[in-house]
């Protein structure tokens, strides 16, 4: 058909009546309706409903709606349904993105790694390494790394300093009362059950779509740490698969503090004498990396001379 | 009132071509589609094409391409039709018509040696 | 393309009588149908376009109607001037093609 017309107060579209030979000038139907008659020298345009299945988005002068998209294919879920006005739109569930027009699972970052980039319904989650004062001790999707406990600020200090994987560990000097200092020679270490130590194999290998270049490749800040060990070593907190602790290490007179923050458990200890803690990082192989482009679902786009 | 006046009739040799006329009167000429129709003997009628001259839009048949060849002159409120390599399938009568409704007198086109 | 046929090809009756013709479609085509009317040695006359409205100046013993692929042309009381070539022309698709054409005789 001949070319549109603008108009400023109501669109108009150009028909030509076939029968006639002529170019008339006809008001466009609204949204969610076609001109089921066209306007004629004598008459206006007759605009129709949409029937069930089809739409129209803007003002038209086309003669038939267009059709819905298709159902929505699994695991797609429907975002805008198929009415009048409006198709229907399929998208991804929480927690998937879309990939090769279907939905997959968002990258979980793992453990040492945190969410740099939240996932959307058509992009993947990006980690990144924790960076210096920050780790991230549970494989996610959602979390970013978090900071280090700041012992200081609670006047306590660093028994074992944080990793990648770990929070510092805090602790304090209790008072001298031998009434409530346990034996020499023992420390209790009682373990929050929900923290369980990820055994990852130590190894080089960057995960998919997780920027090294982003990562800290030196060691973590040590916060300041109480000098002149006494007697005794830091329990090695990573050694075990379940969290099962030796608890008869030479460290004297320890106590710990649970803190819960969050969902999140951090311990802290109460130390009696001081002494200097060392701390490793471990690196983390990934649990998956995040796929690569973002291909859209067809959006089913009409173009009609006569629709805006 | 509305009227088409075409031009008198064409006597041509095949493989020479011919310009038929229609002159509009009684309406604005380019508010208006323009078409020709060819009605042969034996053959029925048969749509050619139509012109827009308000903006010089051109619709053919596939069967008319290359053989039909249509123009308008604002100026003098006249369509054109030029068949071109005439053979005697081309001798028929040719009418110009507003829409489909309105219909100029027609022009006997005779192809012959 | 769209074919039409029209029925009957031609018809005798009398003055005074009432006649349908009729055209059908290959496909549908809404209401976009024409009748025309050619009397011997001339041109063509429009009778009736989008299925039933009459053109100016034409007789009201004219009417058309029917819709989607089937269609018809009745003349009620037929006078001596209505005997002629009729012929129906679908415009709701290039190329536009007509009916074979029905011939109208005094009997």
């Known amino acids: 058909q001949p070319e549109q017309k603008a108009s400023n107060l109501i669109g108009t579209y150009r028909h030509v009546d076939r029968a006639t030979g002529q170019v008339l000038t006809c008001d466009k139907c609204p949204a969610g309706t076609y001109v089921s008659e066209h306007c004629t020298n004598t008459s206006l345009r007759v605009c129709s409903s949409c029937p069930v299945g089809t739409f129209t988005r803007h003002e038209n002068g086309i003669e038939k709606c267009h059709d819905c998209s298709q159902p929505c294919p699994w695991p797609m879920i429907e975002k805008l349904p198929c009415a009048a006005l409006t198709d229907r739109e399929c998208t991804c569930p929480p927690g998937m993105f879309q990939s090769n027009a279907t939905c997959a699972p968002h990258t979980v970052c793992p453990v040492g790694w945190g969410v740099r980039k939240k996932g959307t319904e058509t992009e993947d989650v990006r980690c990144k390494q924790c960076a210096r004062g920050t780790f991230s001790d549970v494989p996610s999707s959602v979390m970013k790394c978090k900071a280090y406990t700041d012992c200081l600020s609670q006047n306590l200090v660093v028994i074992k300093p944080g990793t990648k994987e770990t929070d510092n560990v805090c602790g304090t000097l209790p008072s001298f009362s031998s009434s409530t200092s346990p034996s020499p020679g023992t420390a209790i270490f009682p373990r929050p059950e929900h923290m369980e130590t990820h055994e990852v194999p130590s190894s080089t290998y960057v995960p998919k779509g997780m920027n090294s270049t982003e990562s800290n490749s030196s060691a973590s800040v040590r916060p300041k740490v109480l000098s002149s060990i006494q007697e005794g070593t830091v329990p090695d907190n990573t050694s075990s698969a379940r969290g099962k602790e030796d608890v008869n290490k030479t460290l004297p007179n320890l106590q710990v503090v649970n803190h819960q923050q969050g969902p999140h458990h951090r311990h802290i200890l109460k130390l009696l004498p001081s002494m200097e803690a060392t701390g490793g990082e471990k690196s983390s192989t990934p649990i998956k990396g995040p796929k690569r482009g973002h291909p859209r679902q067809n959006l089913h786009k009409h173009f009609d001379i006569n629709e805006h | 009132q509305v009227q088409l006046q075409q031009s008198g009739t064409e006597l041509a040799r095949p493989g020479a071509s011919v310009k038929l006329s229609c002159k509009a009167s009684g309406y604005t000429f380019t508010d208006y589609y323009l078409n020709w129709m060819k009605q042969g003997t034996g053959q029925g009628l048969e749509w050619i094409g139509e012109i827009y001259p308000g903006g010089d839009h051109t619709y053919y048949n596939e069967k008319f391409k290359g053989k039909a060849t249509l123009t308008a002159d604002k100026s003098s409120n006249t369509a054109f039709m030029q068949l071109s390599s005439l053979t005697s399938e081309d001798s028929a009568v040719y009418f110009c018509?507003?829409?489909?409704?309105?219909w100029g007198q027609g022009t006997l086109v005779t192809v012959s040696l | 393309d769209i074919l039409m046929t029209q029925s009957p090809p031609s018809m005798s009756v009398s003055l005074g009588d009432t006649v349908s013709i009729t055209c059908h479609a290959s496909?549908?085509?809404?209401?976009?149908i024409g009748w025309l009317q050619q009397k011997p040695g001339k041109s063509f006359k429009g009778l009736i376009y989008?299925?039933?409205t009459l053109e100016d100046g034409v007789p009201s013993r004219f009417s058309g109607s029917g819709s989607g692929a089937e269609f018809s042309l009745t003349i009620s009381s037929l006078e001596s001037e209505d005997f002629a070539d009729y012929y129906c022309?679908?415009?709701?698709?290039?190329?536009?093609?007509f009916g074979g054409g029905t011939k109208l005789e005094i009997k």
């Open positions: 022309v679908q415009y709701a698709q290039f190329p536009y093609t």
């Open positions: 496909q549908g085509i809404s209401s976009n």
């Open positions: 989008h299925g039933s």
């Open positions: 018509t507003r829409g489909v409704i309105k």
